[in-house]
Amino acid sequence: MMTGTIETTGNISAKKGGSVILQCHLSSTMAQVTQVNWEQHDHSLLAIRNAELGWHIYPAFKDRVAPGPGLGLTLQSLTMNDTGEYFCTYHTYPDGTYRGRIFLEVLESSVAEHSARFQIP
């Protein structure tokens, strides 16, 4: 039985040209996390964090995706096209797969504040 829950940074906004941290946290389960995959709104993979082997940033994103902090992901040099859904997929044993959702809005405004709060989707 899958008992875990994913907490995420929920809905966040950030300035065009700036950076943003995407964070997820898996709790309430003793399952072993084998891999965490970060995916973009069009379902393309941004990065994989393997428990033993570390990070693999996908070639198309190497210039502006940085691993961490922790199991999170930092998106840099944001463009308006980065607006959309992001997913963290936790692959665990023996539970299976947990998935969290974050919505990022990239704002043109120079006064846009980076707002983030942890919430359970």
């Epitope: 891999q35 995916e39 393309s44 993979l45 994989i48 393997n50 033993e52 082997l53 693999h56 996908y58």
Partner: antibody
């Protein structure tokens, strides 16, 4: 260039333990991931598991109860032990390197493979 | 486990013609797919990673495409040295799994 060479007995009796070693040259096993993959005759390649640069291991859950992968950094080699073998473990066994940072789970260097037959 | 199913099992193509190999994943693996070439009597060689990126030294007649569940390896102009068995592999989730292989021969 990275080179990998498997060694070990080609014939193992049922219920015994299969033991193979992979000698690595041209690269240190304290970097990247070192893997065992097998191919039974007429079947798919099957991932057995790996030992990471730090010595942590991952085993395919289907084999986990029978598999041990270890390493000897002083000899720059790593080993596979598979216990309680049956005829279904007859296969070509490959050792391989995986550079996860650059290529994800794609295996970029393979040994030439060694055939292991389980038979009495 | 994710099952990778390749088609066709074998393929005969004339020299200089296009060869197309398909791989279908039992669930969405995004672009976490690699392709390997195994020539007779040799070990597999990495050709494509991340679904569409050629590995170092791989000729540009080889290309990979696809995302989600459907992937393709294309040899744009088959050469004699391309005769081999080709395998796909997913690494979206562990255990990483392989397809059954497609044998490419010359017609």
């Amino acid at each position: 260039e990275v080179q990998l060479q498997e060694s070990g007995p080609g014939l193992v009796k049922p219920s015994e333990t299969l033991s193979l070693t992979c000698a690595v040259s041209g690269y240190s096993i304290t970097s990247d991931s070192w893997n065992w993959i097998r191919q039974p005759p007429g079947k798919k390649l099957e991932y057995i598991g790996y030992i990471s640069y730090s010595g942590n291991t991952y085993y395919n859950p289907s084999l986990k109860s029978r598999v041990t992968i270890s390493r000897d950094t002083s000899k720059n080699q790593f080993s596979l032990k598979l216990s309680s073998v049956t005829a279904a473990d007859t296969a070509v066994y490959y050792c391989a390197r995986l550079d996860f940072s650059n290529y994800g789970g794609a295996v970029d260097y393979w040994g030439q493979g060694t055939t292991v037959t389980v038979s009495s | 486990d994710i099952v990778m199913t390749q088609s066709p099992d074998s393929l005969a193509v004339s020299l200089g013609e296009r060869a197309t190999i398909n791989c279908k994943a039992s669930q969405n693996v995004r672009t976490a797919v690699a392709w390997y070439q195994q020539k007779p009597g040799q070990s597999p060689k990495l050709m494509i990673y991340s679904a569409s990126y050629r590995y170092t030294g791989v000729p540009d007649r080889f290309s990979g495409s696809g995302s989600g569940t459907d992937f393709t390896l294309t040899i744009s102009s088959l050469q004699a040295e391309d005769v081999a068995v080709y395998y796909c592999q997913q690494y979206y989730t562990t255990p990483w799994t392989f397809g059954g292989g497609t044998k490419v021969e010359i017609k």
